[in-house]
Interface confidence: medium
């Protein structure tokens, strides 16, 4: 597979208004969440921190695509963002709203 | 989407001979690795332990499939297996060869 199509982090800007979360998130209006896109073909690159299961699954898929699906390119490390949100009608500050932005992708 | 096609653990038997690992794994000849198959459509079920990022990505995909890919059904918990393997020509027993079999799937 062309290297450019391999599993990697790509931009994905989330507009809270677009997903209806502006009803409870006051600020920011949106954020850069990123997403993981691309394929996980065998051999799986080291920087994609594949599990043994992912390596085996990718190898089985390579030999027989009917038997197993490809390993999947997913977030392996997420970071928090800071938000102002509504809690019982009061604006509340959450310094670390966990699991919102991708910092690393990998093959699983 | 039909419930039957939703993200879940499905059988995947690994034959070590088939993937060429019989050259160093003496026993067992193979094992039940399982794999995670199916879709992660919004709303993501609680038992699939979705991250906030996965929920948001699934929601964006629902509203605009061009903007974001679906969240992916992947192993979220792996278990070890026991193996007999060759280490510098010596047969060695490994009680816990980690990350080999899927015990839980989720949307990421």
């Amino acid at each position: 597979n062309a290297k450019g199509n391999y599993c990697k982090r790509t931009p994905l800007y989330i507009d809270f208004k677009e997903i209806g979360w502006d009803s409870w998130i006051i600020a920011p209006p949106g954020y850069e969440a990123y997403e993981c896109r691309g394929v996980c073909n065998y051999p799986l690159a080291e920087h994609l921190t594949p599990t043994k299961h992912a390596i085996i699954q990718a190898l089985v898929h390579l030999k027989n695509s009917q038997k197993a699906s490809k390993a999947c390119c997913v977030p392996t490390k997420l970071e928090p963002i800071s938000i102002l949100y509504l809690d019982k009608g009061v604006v509340t500050y959450k310094f670390k709203y966990e699991g919102m932005a991708v910092s690393e992708c990998g093959c699983r | 989407n039909a419930k039957g096609n939703y993200c879940k653990r499905t059988p995947l038997y690994i034959d070590f001979k088939e993937i060429g690992w019989d050259s160093w794994i003496i026993a067992p000849p193979g094992y039940e690795a399982y794999e995670c198959r199916g879709v992660c459509n919004y709303p993501l079920a609680e038992h699939l332990t979705p991250t906030k990022h996965a929920i948001i990505q699934a929601l964006v995909h629902l509203k605009n499939s061009q903007k974001a890919s679906k969240a992916c059904c992947v192993p979220t918990k792996l278990e070890p297996i026991s193996i007999l393997y060759l280490d510098k020509g010596v047969v060695t027993y490994k009680f816990k060869y980690e990350g080999m079999a899927v015990s839980e799937c989720g949307c990421r």
Epitope: I26, P28, P29, L84, V90, V91, Y93 | -
Partner: antibody
């Protein structure tokens, strides 16, 4: 009823430290947030920082490391401490309650920085 | 960091309609909520509009907030202007990192 009252000095010498207390009543500091806002004579409002209900603090970077905000929830007091005052820090200093929006303000305290 | 730009002063006559503007220097005005405050001479400010177009209890419906994307501005419209509306009006929004930004204020004179 809800009240906020700022207390502190009217006059501060240049290079000295400003200490203002905002005493609140009618609500809990663990439920509502408190802003500090100042207004130089004849000028606009300037946000200084916020004491969040959860205990977190946010500062306006314009004040760099000169500013410290703290609180004593048992006494329903929020404190503003600013070091190295200069004449252009002469202003009326307000504390204000932030619920869904800023719904209550103190009457403000006029602080003059002069020798 | 952006600035919120307001004209220094405006004059209007009682009974008329006036529109106060708050222009965002960079970035999209619609991307963060806008708040409007009224401050009478020598008094503390009060919130007139929050979340761009909502009025707190007690604020007359003569006051309304809106966003104009084409001019990248927020507006506070006062219908049927009263003498007691003479005050300074400040807009406020959020910058990235959840910092509170105020406009410089517009002094409204009612003739």
């Amino acid at each position: 009823q809800v009240q906020l009252k700022e207390t502190g000095p009217d006059l501060v010498q240049p290079t000295q430290t400003l200490d203002i207390t905002c005493t609140v009543s009618g609500f809990s500091l663990t439920t509502y947030n408190v802003h500090w806002v100042r207004q130089p004579p004849g000028k606009g409002l300037e946000w200084m920082g916020t004491m969040w209900n959860g205990g977190g603090i946010d500062y306006n970077s314009a004040f760099k490391s000169r500013l410290a905000i703290s609180r004593d929830t048992s006494k329903s007091e929020v404190f503003l401490k600013m070091d190295s005052l200069q004449t252009d820090d002469t202003a009326k200093y307000f504390c204000a309650r932030l619920g869904y929006y800023v719904d209550y303000w103190g009457q403000g305290i006029m602080v003059t920085v002069s020798s | 960091q952006f600035a919120l730009i307001q004209s220094d002063s405006m004059s209007t006559s009682a009974g008329s309609t006036v529109k106060l503007s708050c222009k965002r220097s960079t970035g999209n005005i619609g991307s963060s909520y806008v708040y409007w405050y009224q401050q009478h001479e020598g008094r503390s400010p009060t919130t007139m509009i929050y979340d761009g177009d909502k009025r707190p209890d007690g604020v007359p419906d003569r006051f309304s907030g809106s966003i104009d994307s084409s001019s990248n501005s927020a507006s506070l419209t006062i219908n049927d202007v009263q003498v007691e509306d003479e005050a300074i009006y400040f807009c406020q929004s959020f910058s990235s990192g959840i910092k509170f930004i105020f406009g410089g204020g517009t002094k409204l004179t009612v003739l």
